[in-house]
Every structure is written in structure tokens, then in C-alpha cells.
């Protein structure tokens, strides 16, 4: 987290607010739930208090405009800048300004009022940008999801920073951004994508590029806004420029940002049996065509040319890969060789000898 | 309806530089990814450079660090700088909004000769 120069900060805890126009994408009353649920993110995690006035002079103006709207930072029409807040001062302190041109909602189309809002109020009360991509003062947009909103660790420590604790948080998870250099850090999966390599934890991914140490972390939501926030398996099917993310019962097909139309499916429309839950771990072998399904302790290979479930299987994993354990979380191939994820741990595997060549932290794909 | 036009394209020495544009027609460009493929004669069509609706870019490992793709909203444009081009870099590059599923310019030939 950051917080402003001088450490700008209110005095009091008590702040009011004003909605002095309305934007025509939504009604009032969706505005005000908005704008009410976006103060209560912070008032959660500090002792704040907020309360709304109609009319007069508040802490907080909240207004929409489009362009020049009278405080020399204009808006720039369609997306680009989509809102600004003043940091805690007098006049125009704390005051957030909303871009008109922008098309706000209550969903994941257009932007979504309540996150943009959340954002703006945390500029309102002291916070600058945070570095980290999983914060709500990340300075890109991402819409988060349906599912109810938590705020990120790092915001919460950046604004206790400043007014210290509530009495009592009423959600006290709040997601961490995971370490690469965790020596406990296990992964979720691994893919190739046109020659970076993607790894999967939580609701982020690091990217990779070759020849390349450091690793740049995105929320999964960033690329990918209509997939879920977590996946359980993932491969690449270069030739035909596709990767497929697997996550529950359901699978998706992705060419670079964008989902293949007919997608999500259902993994039983692969030829795995109904009582598979989840695929765990899964890899793309281009010499031939085939790719490992792993699931709980069993492994399954699917032909992808033929769009057909080998027979004989599924095996179990112990069996095929003897030593690499009887789960897998994540896998990929590179070079000839298999390397297996199981917790913290990762197996290099060699195709060639079918057996174990190297045991090393899974952690060490970060270069760490 | 998206249409897509290409311009840019052209003959250049090995170690010149291009920009290719992209004409969008249709008020819901902004709401696709923009990318560029390209295809060399008698070669299968491949990805050259991508941005994200969130402007987040992904290159082909053999252009990365020589073409950038940007794309402006307002103006319906998107463009591809094309640095330090390479004999290899010649082919016709095809503009595409949505994806392998989505919408396709005709295409703009490069020629780069050493």
C-alpha cells in the first residue's frame, strides 16, 4: 500500500458525504446502495463513520461529470480515466468526481460503481496507489465478480495505517496477494501461452517470459473477466493457438482474450465419468496429440485429434509416474521432460527414462 | 458488425520500421480484443501481437522487444509498430477484433528485403 505525502489523513472519524447529481445509467436508489456499500468497505476496517447529508456543504461531494467539470482535471470522454478523488483536506479534499462518460452499473458491464467507487473513497480518506495487483488501490480496473466483496489485505493494512482498527470487522478474510518466494507457496496450474509460460494461484497468475527472471503477477480477472477467479488445471494447444482452463464440472476454451463461443462445457463431454468433480492438473504433448487429465489419484489421456478418451484408462497416477506421489496440482512439459506439482514440492520427470530426475521447490519456476 | 481495415503495409530494407493501422467501423470495437496475425506464403497463419479490452498486451515470442500494439478507442484504431523488421517479418498481417471467432480485415502486405 501507499499513502499520500505528508500522510494526509482526516482529524475526526466522524465524515459526511453528498451525492450532489446522479448519473442516468442507473437509478437513485442503485446509486445510493452503491455509494453506501463503498463507504462501508472502509468503515469495516476503522473506527470511520459515515453519513450521508442531502443537501449543504459534506466531507465527501460526490459528483458526475464529463470533461472539463470544473476542477482543471478533466475526464477524456469513453474509458481511459474513469474517476478522481482528492485526498483529505478542505474544499475540494476528499471530494470524488465520476466520469459521465463513462457507462456505470451494478454488473460486470460497463464499470461497476461500487468497485470504482471503493477505490475513489479509499483516495478520499489517505490512500495512494498500491503497488500490489491484488489490492482494491491497484490503479488498474478489474471487475472482481459476483460473489460477495472482500477487501485485500493490503488495503486494509494501508488504511489502519492511518485511522488504526474498528471495533470489530464483520468479515475478517481478507485475501492476501500470494509471495512467489513462499517456501509453503503451492500452485494451482500451469500453462503455456504463445511461448510465456502462466502460473495459477488463488485468483492470480504470474506471468513468465522467456529468458526472463522476474515474473509479473495479474489478476486471473484481468485477462480473462468472464472466467472464475480461481481455475484448477490449464493447457495449451499451440498449433491451434488455443489454451483450455478447467475449474469444477466446467471447461473453457480461450484464443489469446477471448472464449470460444459454445464455452464453458462440461468436462463429461470429454468422456470422463460423472462422478469427476474437478480435473487437478492437466498437460498437451503437441508430438502427439494427446493430453493427461489428472483427477483425485487417477490420471486420464485424451486425444485431442480425435476428440476421444483413450482406452485403458484412467491408470493411477502412482502407477504411470511412480514417486511424484498420488495427487498433482499442477503440471506442464518443456524439453522432454514432465514436471509434476505436488504441494510445495515439484518432480522433474524424464519421458525418456520414465523415472524422477530431479526433486526441487515448486517455487523455483519463479526463480526463487 | 465490426469491419476492419488495414493500411501501413509496404516494402522496407531489413532493420526498417513499419506502423500499421487499423480501421474499425462499428461503435463496439472498444468492447473486443484487438490482435494481429500474420502469413507468410505458403505458411499457416500466426499470432503476432494482442491487447485486451483492459489494454494488456501479449506478443509472439519472435516479434517481443520489436513490435508494439496499441490500440485507441475513441478513434476506432489500432496499430502496430513494426521495429527492426526482418526479412522473416515478411508476410500479409491480418487485423482481428474478437478473436480466431471474432472479425478479420483483408490483410496488408510486408515485404522486408535484406
Known amino acids: 500500500y501507499n499513502v499520500f505525502p505528508r500522510t494526509l489523513k482526516w482529524s475526526k472519524m466522524n465524515l459526511t458525504y453528498r451525492i450532489v447529481n446522479y448519473t442516468p445509467d442507473m437509478t437513485h436508489s442503485e446509486v445510493e446502495k452503491a455509494f453506501k456499500k463503498a463507504f462501508k468497505v472502509w468503515s469495516d476496517v476503522t473506527p470511520l463513520n459515515f453519513t450521508r447529508l442531502h443537501d449543504g456543504i459534506a466531507d465527501i461531494m460526490i459528483s458526475f461529470g464529463i470533461k472539463e467539470h470544473g476542477d482543471f482535471y478533466p475526464f477524456d470522454g469513453p474509458s481511459g480515466l474513469l474517476a478522481h478523488a482528492f485526498p483529505p483536506g478542505p474544499n475540494y479534499g476528499g471530494d470524488a468526481h465520476f466520469d459521465d462518460d463513462e457507462t456505470w452499473t451494478s454488473s460486470s458491464k460497463g464499470y461497476n460503481l461500487f468497485l470504482v467507487a471503493a477505490h475513489e473513497f479509499g483516495h478520499s480518506l489517505g490512500l495512494d496507489h498500491s503497488k500490489d495487483p491484488g489490492a482494491l488501490m491497484f490503479p488498474i480496473y478489474t471487475y472482481t465478480g459476483k460473489s460477495h466483496f472482500m477487501l485485500p489485505d493490503d488495503d486494509v493494512q494501508g488504511i489502519q495505517s492511518l485511522y488504526g482498527p474498528g471495533d470489530e470487522d464483520p468479515n475478517p478474510k481478507h485475501p492476501k496477494t500470494p509471495d512467489k518466494c513462499d517456501p509453503s507457496l503451492s500452485l494451482d496450474a500451469i500453462t503455456s501461452l504463445r511461448g510465456e509460460t502462466m502460473i495459477f494461484k488463488d485468483r492470480f497468475f504470474w506471468r513468465l517470459h522467456p529468458q526472463q527472471v522476474d515474473a509479473e503477477l495479474f489478476l486471473t480477472k484481468s485477462f480473462w473477466p468472464e472466467l472464475p477467479n480461481r481455475i484448477d488445471a490449464a493447457y495449451e494447444h499451440p498449433s491451434h493457438d488455443l489454451i483450455f482452463i478447467f475449474r469444477g464440472r466446467k471447461f473453457w476454451a480461450l484464443n489469446g482474450y477471448d472464449i470460444l463461443e459454445g464455452y464453458p462445457k462440461k468436462i463429461s463431454e470429454l468422456g470422463l465419468p460423472k462422478e469427476v468433480k474437478k480435473i487437478s492438473a492437466a498437460v498437451h504433448f503437441e508430438d502427439t496429440g494427446k493430453t493427461l487429465l489428472f483427477s483425485g489419484n487417477q490420471v486420464w489421456r485424451y486425444d485431442d485429434t480425435n476428440h476421444i478418451m483413450d482406452k485403458d484408462y484412467p491408470r493411477l497416477i502412482e502407477e504411470d509416474f511412480p514417486g511424484i506421489g498420488d495427487k498433482v496440482d499442477a503440471v506442464y512439459e518443456k524439453n522432454g521432460y514432465i514436471y509434476f506439482f505436488n504441494g510445495p514440492i515439484q518432480f522433474e520427470y524424464s519421458i525418456w527414462s520414465n523415472r524422477i530426475v530431479r526433486v526441487m521447490p515448486a517455487n523455483s519456476i519463479l526463480w526463487c | 458488425e465490426v469491419q476492419l481495415v488495414e493500411s501501413g503495409g509496404g516494402s522496407v530494407q531489413a532493420g526498417g520500421s513499419l506502423r500499421l493501422s487499423c480501421a474499425a467501423s462499428g461503435s463496439t470495437f472498444s468492447r473486443y480484443s484487438m490482435n494481429w496475425y500474420r502469413q507468410a506464403p505458403g505458411k499457416q497463419r500466426e499470432f503476432v501481437a494482442g491487447?485486451?479490452?483492459?489494454?494488456?498486451?501479449n506478443y509472439a515470442v519472435s516479434v517481443r522487444g520489436r513490435f508494439t500494439i496499441s490500440r485507441d478507442n475513441a478513434e476506432g484504431t489500432g496499430y502496430l509498430q513494426m521495429n527492426s523488421l526482418k526479412p522473416e517479418d515478411t508476410a500479409v498481417y491480418y487485423c482481428?477484433?474478437?478473436?480466431?471467432?471474432?472479425?478479420w480485415g483483408l490483410g496488408t502486405l510486408v515485404t522486408v528485403s535484406s
Open positions: 491487447i485486451s479490452v483492459g489494454r494488456i498486451t
Open positions: 482481428n477484433a474478437g478473436g480466431l471467432q471474432g472479425y
